[in-house]
C-alpha cells in the first residue's frame, strides 16, 4: 500500500523559517503534488505549492522555494514575519496524486520536543486520505 | 474529504448524443480549474477533453472541438460537458477533475471514480 511521509523542520539559523519534506513510498508515477497548511487542501487548508513533475512549480507566500529532491519527494522552504508566519503547532499536510490511479496524502507538524535545526528522519505519517 | 461524482454516461449510437454532469462534495476548494479528461481502453490518458479555469477561459482538444461543450451549472461547483455527434473514438472511461493550471494546461489533483462513455451501433 503507497504511504507519504511528512518532516517539518524549523531552522536553527531562522525561527520563523520552515522546511518541509514530503516523500512517497510506492510504485506510481507521480503527477501532482499539494502542500498546504492549516489542514489537509480541500478541508480549509491553504495551499502553499503545487508541482508538477513536466510542468513546473507554483508557490505562493509565504513558500520560498519549493523544489523536487528526488522523483518522489519534494521540499518546501517557508518564511514569514507576522500573519504570514507559520508557527510551531501549525500542521502541514502532502498529497501526491497520480491520476487516476489515486491520490495519498499526509500531514505532519513540528515535533514538539524539537531543537531547531534538529529533526528525527522521515517516517511514514498516517495516511489521512486514499482514493 | 472531497468528492467528485460523474453521472450521465451510458451507450449511445454513433451521431447521438449524451450530457456528463459532475457534483463536488465536501469541498472547499483552492485549485484554480476543472474539467474533464477521458481514459480510452488500452490507452493513456487524455490531457484533457475539455477544461475551464476560474476566469471562464475554455479549452477544448482538437478532436472534440465543435461537437463538445463544458459549462458550470449554477452552482461553481457543478459541471457538465454536453457531447453531440458521438463517434466511437470517443469511447472511453470519463472523469472530472479539479486542479490547477500549468502552462494553459489544467493538471488535475481531486477527480471522480469516472463514468464509462460507450459508442457503438
Known amino acids: 500500500t503507497p504511504e507519504v511521509w511528512v518532516q517539518v523542520r524549523m531552522e536553527a539559523t531562522e525561527l520563523s523559517s520552515f522546511t518541509i519534506r514530503c516523500g512517497f513510498l510506492g510504485s506510481g508515477s507521480i503527477s501532482l503534488v499539494t502542500v498546504s497548511w492549516g489542514g489537509p487542501n480541500g478541508a480549509g487548508g491553504t495551499t502553499l505549492a503545487v508541482l508538477h513533475p513536466e510542468r513546473g512549480i507554483r508557490q505562493w507566500a509565504p513558500a520560498r522555494q519549493a523544489r523536487w529532491e528526488t522523483q518522489s519527494s519534494i521540499s518546501l522552504i517557508l518564511e514569514g514575519s507576522g500573519a504570514s508566519s507559520p508557527c510551531a503547532n501549525t500542521t502541514f499536510c502532502c498529497k501526491f496524486a497520480s491520476f487516476p490511479e489515486g491520490s495519498w496524502e499526509a500531514c505532519g507538524s513540528l515535533p514538539p520536543s524539537s531543537d531547531p535545526g534538529l529533526s528525527a528522519p522521515p517516517t511514514p505519517a498516517p495516511i489521512l486520505r486514499a482514493d | 474529504e472531497v468528492q467528485l461524482v460523474e453521472s450521465g454516461g451510458g451507450l449511445v449510437q454513433p451521431g447521438g448524443s449524451l450530457r456528463l454532469s459532475c457534483a463536488a462534495s465536501?469541498?472547499?476548494?483552492?485549485?484554480?480549474?476543472m474539467g474533464w479528461f477521458r481514459q480510452a481502453p488500452g490507452k493513456g490518458l487524455d490531457e484533457g477533453v475539455a477544461?475551464?479555469?476560474?476566469?471562464?477561459?475554455?479549452k477544448y482538444a482538437d478532436s472534440v472541438k465543435g461537437r463538445f461543450t463544458i459549462s458550470h451549472g449554477n452552482a461553481k461547483y457543478i459541471l457538465y460537458l454536453q457531447m453531440n455527434s458521438l463517434r466511437a473514438e470517443d469511447t472511453a472511461v470519463y472523469y472530472c477533475?479539479?486542479?490547477?493550471?500549468?502552462?494553459?494546461?489544467?493538471?488535475?489533483?481531486?477527480w471522480g471514480q469516472g463514468t464509462q462513455v460507450t459508442v457503438s451501433s
Open positions: 477533475a479539479a486542479g490547477w493550471t500549468f502552462g494553459g494546461q489544467c493538471s488535475p489533483a481531486d
Open positions: 465536501g469541498y472547499s476548494y483552492s485549485g484554480d480549474c
Open positions: 477544461t475551464i479555469d476560474n476566469a471562464g477561459r475554455i
